[in-house]
């Protein structure tokens, strides 16, 4: 058995403290929605594959004035090896699809769960 913040599950190696903190913050965002997150702002959807942290940051960094995701933006920047600025896009973006920030966060969490279940946390 391995332990992820008290999460008992057979198999995969537990993620780093930084990744645990990111997951916790993302869950808090999805669970705390008393009003539309970031006033219902829309962001580009991304292909949740290699380089997803940078792609996620590139998408979310274009949302300004939303304190609810500032911590997430800072955390994602710690996982992305290069500097990301607003307006920057990689090939990982699905440029014809925009979704609400809240939906984007749920999708990111689901992908992290998939990686954890497959033992692919790096």
């Amino acid at each position: 058995l391995t332990c992820l913040g008290g999460f008992a599950s057979p198999g995969p190696v537990p993620p780093s403290t930084a990744l645990r903190e990111l997951i916790e913050e993302l869950v808090n965002i999805t669970q705390n929605q008393k009003a539309p997150l970031c006033n219902g702002s829309m962001v580009w959807s991304i292909n949740l594959t290699a380089g997803m942290y940078c792609a996620a940051l590139e998408s979310l960094i274009n949302v300004s004035g939303c304190s609810a995701i500032e911590k997430t933006q800072r955390m994602l920047s710690g996982f992305c090896p290069h500097k990301v600025s607003a307006g920057q896009f990689s090939s990982l973006h699905v440029r014809d699809t925009k979704i609400e920030v809240a939906q984007f966060v749920k999708d990111l969490l689901l992908h992290l769960k998939k990686l954890f279940r497959e033992g692919q946390f790096n």
Partner: antibody
Framework: EVQLVQSGAEVKKPGASVKVSCKAS????????MHWVRQAPGQGLEWIGN????????IYNEKFQGRVTMTRDTSISTAYMELSRLRSDDTAVYYC????????????WGQGTTVTVSS | DIQMTQSPSSLSASVGDRVTITCRAS??????LNWYQQKPGKAPKLLIY???NLEVGVPSRFSGSGSGTDYTLTISSLQPEDFATYYC?????????FGGGTKVEIK
């Protein structure tokens, strides 16, 4: 063993309040959001609300807004759900349910607490 | 609120049968759909999350599919322990909502 153990059955009169407890064990209580769901006799499931054991923040179903209060005591790894101004249609089994670590489903449930509201 | 409509509300089947339960959402829920099994006097148990992902420890005879507003739970070969009530639940938006349930009874 990872489990949620709830308090015993309650019988209340209309207009009274009830407070149900849910004690977590076998995992880190503050790492998972807790939700409450109820089930009226012979009926389906109805979501009441959630609470973050770490910070205490929560969201309630608007249907219960103003009547429900969710709290927690991290020192004893216990979540509470209090429902006030009880009516006969609040008669139900009340469940606490742990939200999966990644926030997408209820992966652990308490055994349920039967609350009967009758004059 | 998102309404979840399950059908049928009940069905009779025999051991070994293939059973299909459907769940329709009043609006698109982007696959954020979970399935639970509940036996009399017991709490629900998670079977499938995100429409088609089998929860750890759940037998592979259970499977889920669907997208948009329409989702399906399939039991490929019904076993004696599968006679129970099944609920779908959407977690795409608050308030979370459940289907009315499908009771699977012995024929």
């Amino acid at each position: 063993e990872v489990q949620l153990v709830q308090s015993g059955a309650e019988v209340k009169k209309p207009g009274a309040s009830v407070k149900v407890s849910c004690k977590a064990s076998g995992y880190t209580f503050t790492s998972y959001w807790m939700h409450w769901v109820r089930q009226a006799p012979g009926q389906g499931l109805e979501w009441i609300g959630n609470i973050n054991p770490k910070g205490g923040s929560n969201i309630y179903n608007e249907k219960f807004q103003g009547r429900v209060t969710m709290t927690r005591d991290t020192s004893i790894s216990t979540a509470y759900m209090e429902l006030s101004r009880l009516r006969s249609d609040d008669t139900a089994v009340y469940y606490c349910a742990r939200l999966d670590y990644f926030g997408d489903s209820f992966d652990l449930w308490g055994q349920g607490t039967t609350v009967t509201v009758s004059s | 609120d998102i309404q979840m409509t399950q059908s049928p509300s009940s069905l009779s089947a025999s051991v070994g049968d293939r059973v299909t339960i459907t769940c329709r959402a009043s609006q698109g829920i982007r696959n954020y759909l979970n399935w639970y099994q509940q036996k009399p006097g017991k709490a629900p148990k998670l079977l499938i999350y995100y429409a088609s992902n089998l929860e750890v420890g759940v037998p592979s005879r259970f499977s889920g599919s669907g997208s948009g507003t329409d989702y399906t739970l399939t039991i490929s070969s019904l076993q004696p322990e599968d006679f129970a009530t099944y609920y779908c639940q959407q977690d795409n938006r608050f308030p979370y909502t459940f289907g009315g349930g499908t009771k699977v009874e012995i024929k």
